[in-house]
């Protein structure tokens, strides 16, 4: 379980000619809000398909009124993040749609009017727990700047939020059958605990605290049998007397989706699946023409002068789809050699090479040791894009320029004296101590505090370990 978070930084006119008209006017003040829709995988799904990973609406932004004669500036934004909770594992690859909506606050009959200003879409790879990723998307003449990340909700951890961890109770090891939770060395995997009282026979869970029912059972703890014979409707709170499900009001009652859209319930609200040619929260946006800026990511719109004629988007390099909403993932072909990092800049591919490699695709292996000398008889060792010196005895440091003094760290305990030796160091122990570093006291009865003596040496032998 976890949360996808989206931070909108700015929404305003994009660079280049053809600045868009301000969406608000003195006669029609308005305010913006945003909607994000997430789908798992690098799907080729249409914009109308359900937001299987979840969706969220932002708060309304501040009211904005256009200043006459002024170009459209970056528009005032709603406060806070858009948060999309996900209950299951984070898929790692996902598709998103971010819609910018305008709420007109004039004297509309029946309340404010909503209209879709811009929609951007894309497909991305993202590991949970990573840093904020920044993005810029263009929809017609508009530009949206935003950041996003996915984070796990405790006790879930990992790049997919599938591992459960809890702090260790004992400093040394985890409980029976529980593994340490790498890379969090001070945490252990937690056993999965369902909602308290969840039926062990008819319920199950895959996330902490939940209780999902096997077929034929219902209720918060899966203790109520579903009796279909005398039930009228398959939805609603359970009736404790009959075990039936009695109908209750649902978000899709009365079908809030316009223009033939079909409604499906989501955990928090509803989702409209719109027929082709209609968009929006309730399928209320239709008749898209080139004037509406339907081509994303700098796509060129051709035709579509009136709502009855089709438009075609000519996509810039790196984008595809009927609205240029899909980014071509050219890095999936792994064009960068020798472990180089691939960057798809949209207009071009760039490879960021590891140290020791160069070239447009990191194909050239540089000689790491070229022009690099190791002092004092050291030899240069090439490897992994970096050079290192293997130093002669008595020398150390990156280039073997430092004289190594093995006794500098005072390695001999309990007053033992250190002597530099061609093979390293030797400790001459004070009376009553023994060991390679004089760390073990010799007991008066002849037994030492050694945990176990090396083969061939009794614990009481007054010899030094070298």
């Amino acid at each position: 379980a976890g949360v996808f978070e989206l931070q909108i930084h700015s929404f305003g006119p994009g660079p280049g000619p053809g600045a868009p008209r301000s969406p608000c006017s003195a006669r029609l003040p308005c305010r913006l809000f945003f909607r994000v829709c997430l789908k798992p995988g690098l799907s080729e799904e249409a914009a109308e398909s359900p937001c299987a990973l979840g969706a969220a609406l932002s708060a309304r932004g501040p009211v904005y009124t256009e200043q006459p004669g002024a170009p459209a500036p970056d528009l005032p934004l709603p406060d806070g993040l858009l948060q999309v909770p996900f209950r299951d594992a984070w898929p790692g690859t996902f598709s998103f749609i971010i819609e910018t909506w305008r709420e007109e606050l004039g004297d509309q009959i029946g309340g404010p009017a909503w209209s879709l200003l811009a929609r951007v879409a894309g497909r991305r790879r993202l590991a949970a727990g990573g840093p904020w990723a920044r993005d810029i998307q263009r929809a017609g003449a508009w530009e949206l700047r935003f950041s996003y990340r996915a984070r796990c909700e405790p006790p879930a951890v990992g790049t997919a939020c599938t591992r459960l961890c809890r702090p260790r109770s004992a400093p040394s090891r985890c409980g029976p059958g529980l593994r340490p939770c790498a890379p969090l060395e001070d945490e252990c995997e937690a056993p999965l605990v369902c909602r308290a009282g969840c039926s062990p026979e008819h319920g199950f869970c895959e996330q902490p605290g939940e209780c999902r029912c096997l077929e034929g059972w219902t209720g918060p703890l899966c203790t109520v049998p579903v009796s279909t014979s005398s039930c009228l409707s398959p939805r609603g709170p359970s009736s404790a007397t009959t075990g039936c499900l009695v109908p209750g009001p649902g978000p899709c009652d009365g079908n809030p989706c316009a223009n033939g859209g079909s409604c499906s319930e989501t955990p928090r609200s509803f989702e409209c699946t719109c027929p082709r040619g209609f968009y929006g929260l309730r399928c209320e946006v239709s008749g898209v023409t080139c004037a509406d800026g339907p081509c994303f990511n700098g796509g060129l719109c051709v035709g579509g002068a009136d709502p009855d004629s089709a438009y075609i988007c000519h996509c810039p390099p790196g984008f595809q789809g009927s609205n240029c909403e899909k980014r071509v993932d050219r890095c999936s072909l792994q064009p960068c050699r020798n472990g180089g990092l691939c960057l798809d800049l949209g207009h071009a591919l760039r490879c960021r090479c590891r140290a020791g490699f160069a070239g447009p695709r990191c194909e050239h292996d540089l000689d790491d040791c070229a022009g690099r000398a190791c002092a004092n008889g050291g030899t240069c060792v090439e490897g992994g894009g970096a050079h290192r010196c293997s130093c002669a005895l008595g020398f150390g440091g990156r280039d073997c320029r430092e004289r190594a003094d093995p006794c500098a760290a005072r390695p001999c305990a309990h007053g033992g004296r250190c002597y530099a030796h061609f093979s390293g160091l030797v400790c001459a122990c004070a009376p009553g101590y023994m060991g390679a570093r004089c760390e073990f006291p010799v007991h008066p009865d002849g037994a030492s505090a050694l945990p176990a003596a090396p083969p061939g040496l009794r614990p009481g032998d007054p010899q030094r370990y070298l």
């Epitope: 999965l192 369902c194 026979e201 199950f204 895959e206 209780c211």
Partner: nanobody, 127 residues
């Protein structure tokens, strides 16, 4: 420590039947789920059937519904899997699994639910 020992595997022709047994030694399993799992060469382990000891619930994977039956003889502390109308795709090593402390974590056909496993018995369906 519970030991689960499977038996009854072997070679059978398509359309034939086999009955697998799983004997639990040193411990009488009185509640919790027991299940049968299988793993074909080069494939992931999959849940086949599960039964709740001390209750009435039985569950089957879609691929075996109507052909396989899971049952339990409490007096013998033994789990059974009756396999009829066997197909070539049923060829696999079949494992018996037990959950000794009943709890609701994970679906009964999910291997993560079980903390004791047998060594497996090979079922080969071939003409």
């Amino acid at each position: 420590e519970v030991q689960l020992v499977e038996s009854g595997g072997g070679l059978v022709q398509p359309g034939g039947s086999l009955r697998l047994s799983c004997a639990a030694s040193t411990y009488t399993i009185s509640s919790g789920y027991m299940g049968w799992f299988r793993q074909a060469p080069g494939k992931e382990r999959e849940g086949v059937a599960a039964i709740y000891i001390g209750g009435s619930t039985t569950l089957y994977a879609d691929s075996v519904k109507g052909r396989f039956t899971i049952s339990r003889d409490n007096s013998k502390n033994t789990l059974y899997l009756q396999m009829n109308s066997l197909r070539a795709e049923d060829t696999a090593v079949y494992y018996c699994a037990a959950q000794l402390r009943p709890n609701s974590a994970y679906h009964p056909l999910d291997g993560r639910k079980y903390n004791y496993w047998g060594q497996g018995t090979l079922v080969t369906v071939s003409s």
